[in-house]
Each structure stands twice: as structure tokens, then as C-alpha cells.
């Protein structure tokens, strides 16, 4: 069964900078990836970025840079302009779509105990979708 993992990390040098890493574990090719925060895509979450494997990326503030790391994983850099660092308590969700086979989504957040600069362990929250 395909799975999606989500990893959130705070940058050591800039505490207002976060990076979300997402990956797809499974067969098949990915046709589109959407990243949202505050909840799953289409269910109360706010879109941060959409990535197409061949045709580019689209992103919205506070997303700073969305890019492919491998054919099945992406990263999204975020700039937190607020002093209260709301990202630290935010859920980030990634949805990997393989049209028309199906889509798989998972969510994760920065563990409250994680130290700046250390990679937070993956905290996937599988969301079953019957596409």
C-alpha cells in the first residue's frame, strides 16, 4: 500500500524558517503534489504550494521555495514573519496524486520537544482517500 511521509524541521540559523519535507513510498508515477497547512487539502487546510513533476511549481505566502528533491519527494521552505512562530504548532499536509490511480495524503508537525536545527522525525498521520 502506498504511503506518504511528512517531516517538519526548524532551521538552526533562523528560528523563523521552517522546512517541510514530504515523500511518497510506493509504485507508480506522481502527477501532482499539493501542500497545505492547518489541515488536509479540501478539508479546511490552506494551500501553500502545488508541484507538477514536469511543468513547474506554484506557491503562496508564506511559502518561500517549493522544489522536487527526488522523483517522489519534495521540500517546501517557509518564512515565518510573525514573532510568535505559529508554524511550531501547525499541521502540514502533503497529498501525492497519481492520476487516475489514486491520491494519498498524510500530515505532520514539528514535535514540541525538537531542538532548532535538528530534523524532526517523521510524524505521518495517514488519511485514507477513496479516489
Amino acid at each position: 500500500t502506498p504511503e506518504v511521509w511528512v517531516q517538519v524541521q526548524m532551521e538552526a540559523t533562523e528560528l523563523s524558517s521552517f522546512t517541510v519535507h514530504c515523500g511518497f513510498l510506493g509504485p507508480g508515477s506522481i502527477s501532482l503534489v499539493t501542500v497545505s497547512w492547518g489541515g488536509p487539502d479540501g478539508a479546511g487546510g490552506t494551500k501553500l504550494a502545488v508541484l507538477h513533476p514536469e511543468l513547474g511549481t506554484r506557491q503562496w505566502a508564506p511559502a518561500r521555495q517549493a522544489r522536487w528533491e527526488t522523483q517522489s519527494s519534495i521540500s517546501l521552505a517557509l518564512e515565518d514573519s510573525g514573532a510568535s512562530s505559529p508554524f511550531a504548532n501547525t499541521t502540514f499536509c502533503c497529498k501525492f496524486a497519481s492520476f487516475p490511480e489514486g491520491s494519498w495524503e498524510s500530515c505532520g508537525s514539528l514535535p514540541p520537544s525538537s531542538d532548532p536545527g535538528l530534523s524532526a522525525p517523521p510524524t505521518p498521520v495517514p488519511i485514507l482517500r477513496a479516489d
Epitope: 507538477h52 511543468l55 497529498k95 492520476f99
Partner: nanobody, 121 residues
């Protein structure tokens, strides 16, 4: 929960017509395009057969121009595809999808289960 449900498929003779419908429910639409895509038996997925973006711009595949018409009813949260002068090569599973525009084409983010269209005498 996102749900896009297609209907209206079936068996039709060459030269006949069909109207496909797609009803969206529980859908928080945040993309910028919707459209119809198809996959013929034993073949790969076609680029959008007919797509429409949020500005109302419509795009058709060359193979269906002049025969297919896409439309939408925002009040009913529905998308339609009127298919006329159907040919055997139009036989496929048709998917209703919502997504994002990249490079001038609509890339699906959400889609339905598909409806079978068979053109045969």
C-alpha cells in the same frame, strides 16, 4: 471529504450523442481549473479532452473540437460534457477532475471514479 461523481456514460451508436455530468459534493475547491479526461482501453491517459479555468477559458483536444462542449453550473456545483457525433475512438473511461493549470493545461488534483463511454454499432 472531496467527492466528484460522474454520470451519463453508456453505450451509444456511432454518430450518436451523450451528455456527461459531474456533481461535486463536500468539496472545498481551491484549484483553478476543471475538466474532462479520458483513458481508452489499453492506452495511456489523454491530455484534457475539455477543460475550463476559473476565468472561463475553455480548451479542447484537437480530436474533439467541434463535437464536444464543456459547460459548468456554479450554482449546482456541476460540470458537464455534451458529446455529439461520437466515434468508435471516443470509447474510453471519462473522468471529471479539478486541479491546477500548469503550462496552459489543467493538471488533476482531485477526480471521480470515472464513467464508461462505449461507441459501437
Amino acid at each position: 471529504e472531496v467527492q466528484l461523481v460522474e454520470s451519463g456514460g453508456g453505450l451509444v451508436q456511432p454518430g450518436g450523442s451523450l451528455r456527461l455530468s459531474c456533481a461535486a459534493s463536500g468539496y472545498s475547491y481551491s484549484g483553478d481549473c476543471m475538466g474532462w479526461f479520458r483513458q481508452a482501453p489499453g492506452k495511456g491517459l489523454d491530455e484534457g479532452v475539455a477543460t475550463i479555468d476559473n476565468a472561463g477559458r475553455i480548451k479542447y483536444a484537437d480530436s474533439v473540437k467541434g463535437r464536444f462542449t464543456i459547460s459548468r453550473d456554479n450554482a449546482k456545483n456541476s460540470l458537464y460534457l455534451q458529446m455529439n457525433s461520437l466515434r468508435a475512438e471516443d470509447t474510453a473511461v471519462y473522468y471529471c477532475a479539478a486541479g491546477w493549470t500548469f503550462g496552459g493545461q489543467c493538471s488533476p488534483a482531485d477526480w471521480g471514479q470515472g464513467t464508461q463511454v462505449t461507441v459501437s454499432s
